[in-house]
């Protein structure tokens, strides 16, 4: 997917975490058994 940024916005980050995407992780699931 694609996200475009750089459009006008007056919103600001109010939480204590950065709003940038976190580091990628491999979401792997193991079958039970």
């Amino acid at each position: 997917s694609e996200t475009t940024t750089g459009t006008s916005s007056n919103s600001s980050q109010s939480t204590s975490n950065s709003g940038l995407a976190p580091n990628p992780t491999n979401a792997t699931t193991k079958a039970a058994g």
């Epitope: 940024t5 600001s12 950065s18 940038l20 580091n23």
Partner: antibody, heavy 118, light 107 residues
Framework: QVQLVQSGAEVKKPGASVKVSCKAS????????MGWVRQAPGQGLEWMGE????????TFNQKFKSRVTMTRDTSISTAYMELSRLRSDDTAVYYC???????????WGQGTTVTVSS | DIQLTQSPSFLSASVGDRVTITCRAS??????LAWYQQKPGKAPKLLIY???TLHSGIPSRFRGSGSGTEFTLTISSLQPEDFATYYC?????????FGQGTKLEIK
């Protein structure tokens, strides 16, 4: 040690496209976003966008959205940035940079000079 | 978009001096400001992230402080290798934005 090695300098004519590569080593390529930043001669730094190497999700600066294509090949730990419909004001040094969530753009490639001239 | 304004744009100083560069954000970016050093013909190098955390291998004479909208980079005792251009960059939200740079020159 972390290393990002970029492809060599390019000279292009207006209207053409350029594709810059960035080969990563010394870390897990899929564990960090790869960003692209450019710097026109004598000017400051301008973020173009980034790609998630696992999902290929991209986030772009609006300014470049219609002209930039970011891809990656995880099998060779390499990211690519292609800029199309080149203009003279695209003449710049293009950098790839690893983005870590906590530390931001922590390691940079050496830069690729792209000259657009007729 | 967040805008970052650095001051001064140019700074002349001598070896051993203490210098301070300021970066102001147009809206709060919490603590998420990074500082980079760039020398001519070279890629930028990360010095400080999250406002005040020194990146690995960076000498302790570099110090970052601030939060919200006002941040400073202080170099406590200038060394010859510190003469370069310094950029701030917010890493709180997209789009990632850099300040316009501060060129630190030898007096």
């Amino acid at each position: 040690q972390v290393q990002l090695v970029q492809s060599g300098a390019e000279v292009k004519k207006p209207g053409a496209s350029v594709k810059v590569s960035c080969k990563a080593s010394g870390y897990d390529f899929t564990g960090y976003h790869m960003g692209w930043v450019r710097q026109a001669p004598g000017q400051g730094l301008e973020w173009m966008g980034e790609i998630n190497p696992i999902t290929s999700d991209k986030t772009f600066n609006q300014k470049f959205k219609s002209r930039v294509t970011m891809t990656r090949d995880t099998s060779i730990s390499t990211a690519y940035m292609e800029l199309s419909r080149l203009r003279s004001d695209d003449t710049a040094v293009y950098y790839c940079a690893r983005r870590d969530y906590g530390t931001s753009l922590d390691y940079w490639g050496q830069g690729t000079t792209v000259t657009v001239s007729s | 978009d967040i805008q970052l304004t650095q001051s001064p744009s140019f700074l002349s100083a001598s070896v051993g001096d203490r210098v301070t560069i300021t970066c102001r954000a147009s809206a709060s970016i919490s603590k998420y400001l990074a500082w980079y050093q760039q020398k001519p013909g070279k890629a930028p190098k990360l010095l400080i992230y999250a406002g005040s955390t020194l990146h690995s291998g960076i000498p302790s004479r570099f110090r970052g402080s601030g939060s919200g909208t006002e941040f400073t980079l202080t170099i406590s005792s200038l060394q010859p290798e510190d003469f370069a251009t310094y950029y701030c960059q917010q890493h709180n939200e997209y789009p990632i934005i850099f300040g316009q740079g501060t060129k630190l020159e030898i007096k």
